[in-house]
């Protein structure tokens, strides 16, 4: 289990859509940093499909990778719960109608671990800031 | 599929600069690094350098410090790479490689056909 | 800078037999408990197309004769068995690190 105080909010479905869809621009960077640490022919194929999901103009924010291997495998799980967990609530949502509210209060608290705690600042933000 | 398109060969004089292009398709070009590398004839291969279409980010190997740079278009999803002050030692096939998406450098996994660059008077 | 050291330089083998190519590094290249080191196979006039990432991962459509392992220093690319579609020159690079680097090659001809 991850402290409280290590935890971060993906915002998994956005809350401004009837139904609701999924928040391709905060789950996307998550799948582009672990790309390297996974099978990088099946990420590429999630990341090109949540692109197609994604608005043009959305930001995204740059994500870094935990240095210690063991905190690295754990992230990398947590973001593959958390992303079948958010699909899972994406098919139920479009199952059952619009019960907007509730399957919104559920997932939008679905945590993860902040990959960029605990990191030298030059390991984090910009890709080019790596060396 | 995954191409990587690269401009024709050029022969150019010593001294004079020149730039290659490198168009990609078959993905999302903002995501992933461009990697160029450089293969002289009957020789090895030797990395020049990487930009990031996202945020235009850039490292070089020092060898091509002020011998190579690095730009995109994100536009028309093309990558490009002027050498300047040719000189002969900078006759060698050129190519254009996609990397990874993320700060941790990954594997170049589709290559271009390459760019013949010939110096000569 | 991380020098790879590939061997042997050329290499010749029997169809059907088994090639094995080293590549040492002056330095690990393993990180996050994975090994950045990468192989490709390239043929004359062609570009180089990648064979196994990451040490021992099999890319995309190369077929299972194909294989890679090691880890920190010592990584081995092995062919078995070899087919004639298979003399080429083949390269290590590693990623752990820029610049990266890549091994002078290992030239694979048929005996």
């Known amino acids: 289990m991850v402290p409280e105080s290590n935890r971060t909010l993906l915002l998994c479905l956005t809350s401004d859509s009837q139904p609701p869809r999924l928040n391709s621009s905060a789950i996307l960077p998550y799948f582009r940093a672990i790309r390297p640490l996974s099978d990088k022919n099946i990420i590429d194929k999630i990341i090109e499909q949540l692109d197609k999901l994604k608005f043009q103009h959305e930001p995204e924010t740059e994500i870094s990778v935990p240095a210690d291997t063991f905190e690295c495998k754990s992230f990398i799980l947590t973001i593959l719960q958390q992303f079948s967990a958010c699909l899972e609530s994406v098919f139920k949502s479009l199952n059952s109608g619009p019960q907007k509210g509730e399957l919104n209060s559920k997932l939008e608290g679905k945590p993860i671990p902040n990959p960029l705690l605990g990191l030298d600042s030059t390991r984090t933000g910009h890709h080019h800031h790596h060396h | 599929q995954v191409q990587l398109q690269q401009s024709g060969a050029e022969l150019v004089k010593p001294g004079a600069s020149v730039k290659l292009s490198c168009k990609a398709s078959?993905?999302?070009?903002?995501?992933?690094?461009i990697n160029w590398v450089r293969q002289r004839p009957e020789q090895g291969l030797e990395w020049i350098g990487w930009?990031?279409?996202?945020?235009?980010?850039?490292k070089y190997n020092e060898t091509f410090k002020g011998k190579a740079t690095l730009t995109t278009d994100k536009s028309s999803s093309t990558a490009y790479m002027q050498l300047s002050r040719l000189t002969s030692e900078d006759s060698a096939v050129y190519f254009c490689?996609?990397?990874?998406?993320?700060?941790?450098?990954?594997?170049?996994?589709?290559w271009g056909q390459g760019t013949s660059v010939t110096v000569s008077s | 800078d991380i020098v790879l050291t590939q061997s042997p330089a050329s290499l010749a083998v029997s169809l059907g037999q088994r090639a094995t190519i080293s590549c040492r590094a002056s330095?690990?290249?393993?990180?996050?408990?994975?090994?950045?080191m990468h192989w490709y196979q390239q043929k004359p006039g062609q570009p180089p197309k990648l064979l196994i990432y990451?040490?021992?991962n099999l890319e995309s459509g190369i077929p299972a004769r194909f294989s890679g392992s090691g880890s920190r220093t010592d990584f081995t690319l092995t062919i078995n068995p070899v087919e004639t579609d298979d003399v080429a020159t083949y390269y290590c690079?590693?990623?752990?690190?820029?610049?990266?680097?890549f091994g002078a090659g290992t030239k694979l001809e048929l005996k």
């Open positions: 490689a996609r990397g990874g998406t993320s700060v941790i450098r990954d594997a170049m996994d589709y």
């Open positions: 078959g993905y999302t070009f903002k995501y992933y690094d």
């Open positions: 930009i990031f279409p996202g945020d235009g980010g850039t």
């Open positions: 330095e690990s290249v393993d990180n996050y408990g994975i090994s950045f």
């Open positions: 990451r040490a021992s």
């Open positions: 690079q590693q990623s752990n690190k820029d610049p990266l680097t």
